[in-house]
Amino acid sequence: ESLGTEQRVVGRAAEVPGPEPGQQEQLVFGSGDAVELSCPPPGGGPMGPTVWVKDGTGLVPSERVLVGPQRLQVLNASHEDSGAYSCRQRLTQRVLCHFSVRVTDAPSSGDDEDGEDEAEDTGVDTGAPYWTRPERMDKKLLAVPAANTVRFRCPAAGNPTPSISWLKNGREFRGEHRIGGIKLRHQQWSLVMESVVPSDRGNYTCVVENKFGSIRQTYTLDVLERSPHRPILQAGLPANQTAVLGSDVEFHCKVYSDAQPHIQWLKHVEVNGSKVGPDGTPYVTVLKTAGANTTDKELEVLSLHNVTFEDAGEYTCLAGNSIGFSHHSAWLVVLPAEEELVEADEAGSVYAG
């Protein structure tokens, strides 16, 4: 049951885990106020070294910016101090606390606002745009298989309600610039591109602005194209095995293939004392191959029961698809039962079924 997760891993850049959305605070300060942000250690335990970050950039202490392990002070705040602040563990970069700070012309009311994605005019404060959920905007790289759909979002707020526009590679981006067009949802602060193609690769920037200022976020889109290839076999499989006479053995072979693979298990044999034919091709016997009701999962395991000395030798997992073949081999050594204890002491690699 791995589809969603795997697709997500393929499709997204790695990110530092952040706090739960409920842990984010929306704070409004008046121009000239002292911005004070406090971040106590989670669970009251030791905090370790921390770093304070504004809009993704580490804050440098100054006469106006006072940085402590659990507290940040910005004196004589101005519009430029609006933004997303976070306190992170220095070593892991894990976000411990997250604040969305707005500095307005009016004296601060002390009221926090809900972090909704929809724009709302509060009718009270006026101020520059700010991201409503800044902790969700850390990820900037999106890699997507061709023919799928991409959505970029920049949910923001401000008073008056800001406008949003989109750039591609620094230039105005409109529907006529791509086959299939684009879908804009201003109330959802989103840009949607259906059925992406390689020419959609690039940098997409949302610009959110009102008369008090503007903020922007740039995302990078990579569109992945698949080139067909022969099956890929997991390294180290099948693995060499040592078994005691009469025990059971399993060889495993993990196959990755775009095209439907055909899997076979072969055992190398000798014919008239020779392991290879005149053309250099090894002599083999087919032990297991696809049948009407055989699943790929079943074919990825070769089970040998009650092994005899004749079972010793080289085994090969052969996987083919419409592009080509791949194979990995492993050896089985069969020991007489009385050697079991001695061998186990010496090598620690004996399996007694």
């Epitope: 499709g11 900037k140 298989p145 799928n148």
Partner: antibody
């Protein structure tokens, strides 16, 4: 033009097996997924499972897990639904549908949308 | 699994009517909801994805809205070809699940 054509349906006894095929054309088979959805006579839609041929990853509904297997052959642009240990309650019209993802950095899930559907093939499990 | 509950299960309407179908999820599914139309003996057709995005080629009289647990499909002016059964479906988690359907019949 995107097209999906199912085949392989028919009458089968309980405990029997059947393999359905879904031949696709008109789109990049390795970039999107294929879902199987079934509809019992006079009933609603029930998702059966899906495959992303790109990496072969599959998901199944609990009701068919361990009995049904979805696979794909990208060289033939065809997806398959192998149905084993069939039961009377598996009687339905089986549809395959092209499935694409909506990738969105802002959220922690990938939404999957089934946009093109085949005409369906009827599977009847009866003794 | 997430349950999707549609209402009403059936409705009668006339050509030109405004029709609204609702769908409620048993838990928050964000905006990961699609709507499908199915006519007897035919395969379903995608109308709306991501709760409010009209799929290409679908007439603009169809619209979708909602987020979280409550979703709505609206047909602004019912046309003769719109008499069919409509299904909502969540794709927030695996397995995706469908509503039981709403049959729109001619009054």
């Amino acid at each position: 033009e995107v097209q999906l054509v199912e085949s392989g349906g028919g009458l089968v006894q309980p405990g029997g097996s059947l393999r359905l095929s879904c031949a696709a054309s008109g789109f990049t088979f390795t970039s999107t997924g294929i879902s199987w959805v079934r509809q019992a006579p006079g009933k609603g839609l029930e998702w059966v499972g899906r495959i992303y041929p790109t990496n072969g990853s599959t998901n199944y509904a609990d009701s068919v897990k361990g009995r049904f297997t979805i696979s794909a052959d990208t060289s033939k642009n065809t997806a398959y639904l192998q149905m084993n240990s069939l039961r009377a309650e598996d009687t339905a019209v089986y549809y395959c549908a092209r499935t694409y993802g909506i990738y969105d950095l802002y959220v922690d899930y990938t939404e999957y949308v089934m946009d093109y559907w085949g005409q369906g093939t009827l599977v009847t499990v009866s003794s | 699994d997430i349950q999707m509950t549609q209402s009403p299960s059936s409705l009668s309407a006339s050509v030109g009517d405004r029709v609204t179908i609702t769908c409620r999820a048993s838990q928050d599914v964000s905006t990961a909801v699609a709507w499908y139309q199915q006519k007897p003996g035919k395969a379903p057709k995608l109308l709306i994805y991501s709760a409010s995005f009209l799929y290409s080629g679908v007439p603009s009289r169809f619209s979708g809205s909602g987020s979280g647990t409550d979703f709505t499909l609206t047909i602004s002016s019912l046309q003769p070809e719109d008499f069919a059964t409509y299904y909502c479906q969540q794709s927030y988690t695996t397995p995706p699940t469908f509503g039981q359907g709403t049959k729109v019949e001619i009054k």
